[in-house]
C-alpha cells in the first residue's frame, strides 16, 4: 500500500495524464462491497439510478458492476497497481450506458448516462491495498477517493497516511 507522499507523487500528474488507448485493456464483472462487507447496490428511481450501501438479506443477489481497465501513459510506482509499468485507471458501469461519475463540487458519486469517449470524471485510478482491497482515486481530483459516508458513496479527501488505509475508502471485488 501507499504512504500519502507516495499517493501525492503518484497522482500529481493525473490532470495531465491521458489514457493510452480509447479502448479498455480488459474488463471484469464483479460485485462491489465495502471493507465491512456491505453491498453497493443500484436502484432505478424516477428514470435515474440511485446508489446505496446496504446489508443484503441472506441469499439476496448482489448487483454487478463492470470494471473497465485502461492503461495510463503515467508510469506506475507500485507493483500490482499497473500493467507493464503503466498506471491503471478504471471506469465502473452497473448497467449499459451508465457510469459512475465523480462530482467534485458536491463531493458526491453519481450515475450518469453518457456515450464514449467518457469524460475524465468517469475515470478512477485503481490502487491495490491490503487484504485484497482496492481503492478508487478521482482522476480529476488527486487525493480524493470514492468512499462511504452515511450509507451512500461520497468523495472523501485523503490528507494523511493514516487515512489512506481507512476502512471507508476500501472496497472488495468478488464474482459472487
Amino acid at each position: 500500500a501507499f504512504g500519502i507522499s507516495g499517493v501525492q507523487k503518484y497522482t500529481r500528474a493525473l490532470h495531465d495524464s491521458s489514457i493510452t488507448g480509447i479502448s479498455p485493456i480488459t474488463e471484469y464483472l464483479a460485485s462491489l462491497s465495502t471493507y465491512n462487507d456491505q453491498s453497493i447496490t443500484f436502484a432505478l428511481e424516477d428514470e435515474s439510478y440511485e446508489i446505496y450501501v446496504e446489508d443484503l438479506k441472506k441469499d439476496e443477489k448482489k448487483d454487478k458492476v463492470l470494471l473497465s481497465y485502461y492503461e495510463s501513459q503515467h508510469p506506475s510506482n507500485e507493483s500490482g497497481d499497473g500493467v507493464d509499468g503503466k498506471m491503471l485507471m478504471v471506469t465502473l458501469s452497473p448497467t449499459k450506458d451508465f457510469w459512475l461519475h465523480a462530482n467534485n463540487k458536491e463531493h458526491s458519486v453519481e450515475l450518469h448516462k453518457c456515450e464514449k469517449p467518457l469524460p475524465d470524471q468517469a475515470f478512477f485510478v485503481l490502487h491495490n491495498m491490503h487484504s485484497n482491497c482496492v481503492s478508487f482515486e478521482c482522476k480529476t481530483d488527486p487525493g480524493v477517493f470514492i468512499g462511504v459516508k452515511d450509507n451512500h458513496l461520497a468523495l472523501i479527501k485523503v490528507d494523511s497516511s493514516e487515512n489512506l488505509c481507512t476502512e471507508n475508502i476500501l472496497f472488495k471485488l468478488s464474482e459472487t
Epitope: 488507448g21 480509447i22 479502448s23 479498455p24 485493456i25 480488459t26 474488463e27 471484469y28 464483472l29 463492470l66 481497465y69 500490482g80 500493467v83 491503471l88 448497467t95 449499459k96 464474482e175
Partner: antibody, heavy 128, light 108 residues
Framework: ELQLQESGPGLVKPSETLSLTCTVS??????????WGWIRQPPGKGLEWIGS???????YYNPALKSRVTISVDTSKNQFSLMLTSVTAADTAVYYC????????????????????WGQGTTVTVSS | EIVLTQSPGTLSLSPGERATLSCRAS???????LAWYQQKPGQAPRLLIY???SRATGIPDRFSGSGSGTDFTLTISRLEPEDFAVYYC?????????FGGGTKVEIK
C-alpha cells in the same frame, strides 16, 4: 517479463483425450486482472480460439468445441490446463496458451477476448 | 458468428514501402474491439494493435490501426525487413471471437 510455456504429449491417439498445461512465469495468475486462454492453429491454416478462463475458475468456451473442452486453473502452481476429449485428425495443430484481455458485451451478456502475451506453442499430432 | 475477410491474400512490397492491409467484418460492431497480430514462420502470433487503433506495448509507431463498423485497416508506414510476415485481424466484440484468414506480406 511475463512468459508462458505449454507442455504435454506431442502425439495423441484418435478418440483419446488431449491434455496440455500452460505454466506462467514472471507474474501471478491470481493477481492478474487478465484472463488466460488457449488458441490453436492447424498446419498451414489460421487461428482458432478454444476457450478462456479467469483465475477464479470461471470459463468461457468456443461453442464449436464446448462439448469436448475443459479448461481449468491451478493458482498454487501458477498453471492452467486444457483437456480436449474424443480427438480426431482434425485436432492436429499447434496449440498456444496466452494471456487475454476480456471485454464484455452488454447486449449478449458475454465476454470476448484478445490475446496480448503468447506462449511459443506446442505441436500436437493426432494419429494412431 | 462474425466472419472476418482479409485482403489482399498476399501483398508483395519492398522495404521502405507503405503497406495497407484490410479487414472486413460480416456484421458491423460499434465497439471497435478489433485486434491485429503479426506471425512469422515457426513463431507464435504477436499482438500489434487492440481496440482497432491502440498500439500494444513495445510496438513501433510505424504500425497503426484504424477503422470502425465493418471496415478496418492496418498500416505499416515504412516496411522494415523484420515486418515481412503474416498478419491476422481478430474481432472480440462478441463471442465467439473470430480471426481473419490472414494477409501475407512478402518481399517483392
Amino acid at each position: 517479463e511475463l512468459q508462458l510455456q505449454e507442455s504435454g504429449p506431442g502425439l495423441v491417439k484418435p478418440s483419446e483425450t488431449l491434455s496440455l498445461t500452460c505454466t506462467v512465469s514472471g507474474g501471478s495468475i491470481r493477481s492478474s486482472i487478465f484472463y488466460w486462454g488457449w488458441i490453436r492453429q492447424p498446419p498451414g491454416k489460421g487461428l482458432e480460439w478454444i476457450g478462456s478462463i479467469y483465475y477464479s475458475g470461471r470459463t468461457y468456451y468456443n461453442p464449436a468445441l464446448k462439448s469436448r473442452v475443459t479448461i481449468s486453473v491451478d493458482t498454487s502452481k501458477n498453471q492452467f490446463s486444457l483437456m480436449l476429449t474424443s480427438v480426431t485428425a482434425a485436432d492436429t495443430a499447434v496449440y498456444y496458451c496466452a494471456r487475454a484481455g476480456g471485454l464484455y458485451n452488454w447486449n449478449d451478456e458475454s465476454f470476448s477476448f484478445y490475446m496480448d502475451v503468447w506462449g511459443q506453442g506446442t505441436t500436437v499430432t493426432v494419429s494412431s | 458468428e462474425i466472419v472476418l475477410t482479409q485482403s489482399p491474400g498476399t501483398l508483395s512490397l519492398s522495404p521502405g514501402e507503405r503497406a495497407t492491409l484490410s479487414c472486413r467484418a460480416s456484421q458491423s460492431f460499434s465497439s471497435s474491439y478489433l485486434a491485429w497480430y503479426q506471425q512469422k514462420p515457426g513463431q507464435a502470433p504477436r499482438l500489434l494493435i487492440y481496440g482497432a487503433s491502440s498500439r500494444a506495448t513495445g510496438i513501433p509507431d510505424r504500425f497503426s490501426g484504424s477503422g470502425s463498423g465493418t471496415d478496418f485497416t492496418l498500416t505499416i508506414s515504412r516496411l522494415e525487413p523484420e515486418d515481412f510476415a503474416v498478419y491476422y485481424c481478430q474481432q472480440y466484440d462478441r463471442s465467439p471471437l473470430t480471426f481473419g484468414g490472414g494477409t501475407k506480406v512478402e518481399i517483392k
